[in-house]
């Protein structure tokens, strides 16, 4: 008897109710490997949810969450609060980074700007609440006159980012 | 801060009908992402889910009370409603109102709950 | 529909004891449950959600473990303010709750 259930596709249940025959999934459900005495409920996008991937007969719904929202958990099993970037999201919603930190994204914390003079450089651009500072030479590399293995870099014209 | 106050309890007679409130302060019904749902618990019972409205005015209903319940929302008093039909004994409870998900992060569990109201199904 | 069975339905605990609490799902449910502590003449109040996940305010004796059918809330060290009744409740598909499990002292 064994035998016959193990001949059960996925997308189907070994069905003890009419001598071990393999009937299809119930609508709404799915078994993904074969030899299934019972098909599984679809997950179901409900609320904060939206279905990504619909249910088959042999794989589970996918959901994804509505506009303004971002998934987290494992498979989407929750929704969090989108939030601008420079911003980050505390318990009473979104809150702008604080002066030093920066986020660069709609999700996650706002995290401090690199400081430069930590690896002997400085700051070239300055950093905002959406961007980080970007570190330049060290102040030595730039003075006149310093000695260096390598050549200095060329001097950027006003009005000209760094590439 | 997110509050939900429940009315419309009370006693009621075998076959007639009910409709429960819920005034919901500190959030809107119409929030995306955001359901509210009724719960509710029999004496010395446990607790049962009925039904749920989201953001989006979607239903979802217990399979096994669903020809009994309607479960609808005035966002314009921002509150929530549940009418329950053809009532008997065994539908005698303390009716809870509760909001879907916590504050930032949502999922289908319930974060904020009302203090329920007492229905009594009795002649 | 998904059924959820908690495991035991009550049991006498002294107040310092470990305490765990098993739930078991019909079916897998992932991740997609909750847990609440409900004290006589008030509402639930929620613990734990997406299985593990502490509810702010809630405090840190309190944990939730497990995936798929089995899950067990746990509390270290059990408090005189802990004597309650639990509940799990599944999400994955409409929402379920457990029968309940009582927390008595012994």
């Known amino acids: 008897l064994q035998d016959l259930c193990s001949n059960c596709p996925a997308g189907t249940f070994c069905d003890n109710n009419r001598s071990q025959i393999c009937s299809p999934c119930p609508p709404n459900s799915f078994s993904s490997a074969g030899g299934q005495r019972t098909c599984d409920i679809c997950r179901q996008c409900k609320g904060v949810f939206k279905t990504r991937k619909e249910c088959s007969s042999t794989s589970n719904a996918e959901c994804d969450c509505i506009s303004g929202y971002h998934c987290l958990g494992a498979e989407c099993s929750m929704c969090e609060q989108d939030c601008k970037q420079g911003q980050e999201l505390t318990k009473k919603g979104c809150k702008d980074c604080c002066f030093g930190t920066f986020n660069d994204q709609k999700r996650g914390i706002c995290r401090p700007w690199t400081n430069c003079s930590l690896d002997g450089k400085s700051v070239l651009v300055n950093g905002t609440k959406e961007r980080d500072v970007v570190c330049g030479p060290s102040p030595a590399d730039l003075s006149p006159g310093a000695s260096s293995a390598t050549p200095p870099a060329p001097a950027r014209e006003p009005g000209h980012s760094p590439q | 801060e997110v509050q939900l106050v429940e009315s419309g309890g009370g006693l009621v007679q075998p076959g007639g009908s009910l409709r429960l409130s819920c005034a919901a302060s500190?959030?809107?019904?119409?929030?995306?992402?955001?359901?509210v749902g009724w719960i509710r618990q029999a004496p010395g019972k446990g607790l049962e889910w009925l039904a749920l409205?989201?953001?989006?005015?979607?239903?979802y209903y217990s399979p096994s009370l669903k020809s009994r319940l309607t479960i609808s929302r005035d966002n314009s008093k921002n509150t929530l409603y549940l009418q329950l039909n053809s009532l008997r004994a065994e539908d005698t409870a303390v009716y809870y109102c509760?909001?879907?998900?916590?504050?930032?992060?949502?999922?289908?569990?319930?974060?904020?709950w009302g203090q329920g109201t007492l229905v009594t199904v009795s002649s | 529909d998904i059924q959820l069975t908690q495991s035991p339905s009550s049991l006498s605990a002294s107040v310092g004891d470990r305490v765990t609490i098993t739930c078991r799902a019909s079916?897998?449910?992932?991740?997609?449950l909750a847990w609440y502590q409900q004290k006589p003449g008030k509402a639930p109040k929620l613990l734990i959600y997406?299985?593990?996940n502490l509810e702010t305010g809630v405090p840190s004796r309190f944990s939730g473990s497990g995936s798929g059918t089995d899950f067990t809330l746990t509390i270290s060290s059990l408090q005189p303010e802990d004597f309650a009744t639990y509940y799990c409740?599944?999400?994955?598909?409409?929402?379920?709750f457990g029968q309940g499990t009582k927390v008595e002292i012994k």
């Open positions: 509760a909001r879907g998900g916590s504050d930032t992060v949502i999922g289908d569990w319930f974060a904020y």
């Open positions: 500190g959030f809107s019904l119409s929030t995306g992402g955001v359901g």
């Open positions: 409205i989201d953001w989006a005015d979607d239903k």
């Open positions: 079916q897998s449910i992932g991740s997609y």
């Open positions: 997406d299985a593990s």
């Open positions: 409740q599944q999400g994955y598909y409409l929402w379920t």
